[in-house]
Interface confidence: low
């Protein structure tokens, strides 16, 4: 994992102010596979190259993301740069031999966040709870939440309960607890991302 | 403990070139950026230019284009800022700055581990 | 680039007081900004980002709100340790840019 984020980024990178104009524009109109979202057109065109490698990939995970990147390059007539892309992607990342289709991620599906692709792992493997209540409490924790999650007896149904209020969070509460994550257990979210 | 550790401070004569040093410790260098900002005396702060130390990217203020030059060396975990053809408008302190970068897209383009900061005075 | 117009340079204040540091934005910046305190001789630190987040370990004396184009970071409380210049900044698009600084004073 992140070999075709760089990738992505190398090529975005390169585009000239007005060729990355072009491409989130193009990004726009461009088909879809079944089941995929596309980026709001407000927060689209604002972004620099790492804003948008980051959005393409929470919105289509790498190997798509890195599909539909080279995609839209090939549409803008960047044939060349969108083959280094796709030689990228493809090096050494295990990928798929041609013909055959690589399996979906079944941990990632488009859109989620890291803490909603990783729920799982995160209610068996977090220890530092109480840690994380603090860094959430009074920003996206209520007193009540903050003491329902504290008088649950394990971590993992601490975590199981904490998570039983992520579906009214937007991506900042939920950056949130990413972030209290990094800095409490960042070995775990390294491995995470790894996976 | 996160922390930025930053190079001595540097003497140098007007046209010549300082490479400055920023060693991170307490955290996996590749998961977050390195922003570099210029703070002159009794003056405000000034965004130079960033690099992801995973892929060696790199973006700039326009303004520091061509006077600034942003490298990074995984092995040591450390960022690195080369000033050339110095005149006594760099004379500055230039702090090196963590940013977080995340998997949302959002704007995580906040610092929020600041370096111990690296004072460059040029005079002749 | 855009502006980031901090209104006031100085601001006097007493211990226990509650103060509010205002900061405005020439265009829409999404709500993506960030306030930094810094001491004399030492360097800048993360207090609120995205508006209104709390960085870890801030204390919750230190609040920031947004209203369009319009950010405001207080202290509800000020103590002495508060004495220092406080930054707003927008990390919503590049250059990222900074005000000018409020210098906050102990009457």
């Known amino acids: 994992m992140g070999r075709a984020r760089d990738a992505i980024l190398d090529a975005l990178e390169n585009l000239t102010a007005e060729e990355l104009k072009k491409f989130k524009l193009k990004l726009l109109s461009v088909p879809l596979r079944e089941g995929y979202g596309r980026i709001p057109r407000g927060a689209l065109l604002s972004m620099d190259a790492l804003d948008l490698t980051d959005k393409l990939v929470s919105f289509y995970l790498e190997t798509y993301g890195a599909e539909l990147t080279a995609n839209v390059l090939r549409d803008m007539g960047l044939q060349e740069m969108a083959g280094q892309l796709q030689a990228a992607t493809h090096q050494g990342s295990g990928a798929a031999p041609a013909g055959i289709q690589a399996p979906p991620q079944s941990a990632a599906k488009p859109g989620l966040h890291f803490i909603d692709q990783h729920r799982a792992a995160l209610i068996a493997r977090v220890t530092n709870v109480e840690w994380l209540l603090d860094a959430l409490y009074g920003k996206v924790l209520t007193d009540e939440q903050y003491q329902a999650v504290r008088a649950e007896p394990t971590n993992p149904s601490k975590m199981r309960k904490l998570f039983s209020f992520t579906p009214a969070w937007n991506w900042t509460c939920k950056d949130l607890l990413l972030q209290a994550l990094r800095e409490s257990q960042s070995y775990l979210v390294e491995d995470l991302e790894r996976s | 403990q996160v922390q930025l550790q930053q190079s001595e401070p540097e003497l140098a004569r007007p046209g010549a070139s300082v490479k400055l040093s920023c060693t991170a410790s307490g955290y996996t260098f590749i998961n977050y950026g390195v922003s570099w900002v210029r703070q002159r005396t009794g003056q405000g702060l000034e965004w130079i230019g960033r690099?992801?130390?995973?892929?060696?990217?790199?973006r700039f203020n326009e303004k520091f284009q061509g006077k600034a030059t942003l490298t990074a060396d995984t092995s040591s975990s450390t960022a690195y800022m080369e000033l050339r053809s110095l005149t006594s408008e760099d004379s500055a302190v230039y702090f090196c700055t963590r940013f977080p970068y995340a998997f949302s897209g959002n704007s995580y383009w906040y610092f929020d581990v600041w370096g111990t900061g690296t004072t460059v005075t040029v005079s002749s | 680039d855009i502006v980031m117009t901090q209104s006031h340079k100085f601001m006097s204040t007493s211990i226990g007081d509650r103060v509010s540091i205002t900061c405005k934005a020439s265009?829409?910046?999404?709500?993506?900004v960030a306030w930094y305190q810094q001491k004399p001789g030492q360097s800048p630190k993360l207090l609120i980002y995205?508006?209104?987040f709390r960085y870890t370990g801030v204390p919750d004396r230190f609040t920031g709100s947004a209203s369009g184009t319009d950010f405001t970071f207080t202290i509800t409380t000020v103590q002495a340790e508060d004495l220092a210049v406080y930054y707003c900044q927008q990390h919503f698009d590049t250059p990222y840019t900074f005000g000018g600084g409020t210098k906050l004073e102990i009457k």
């Open positions: 265009q829409d910046v999404s709500a993506a």
């Open positions: 995205s508006s209104s």
């Open positions: 690099i992801y130390p995973r892929s060696g990217n790199t």
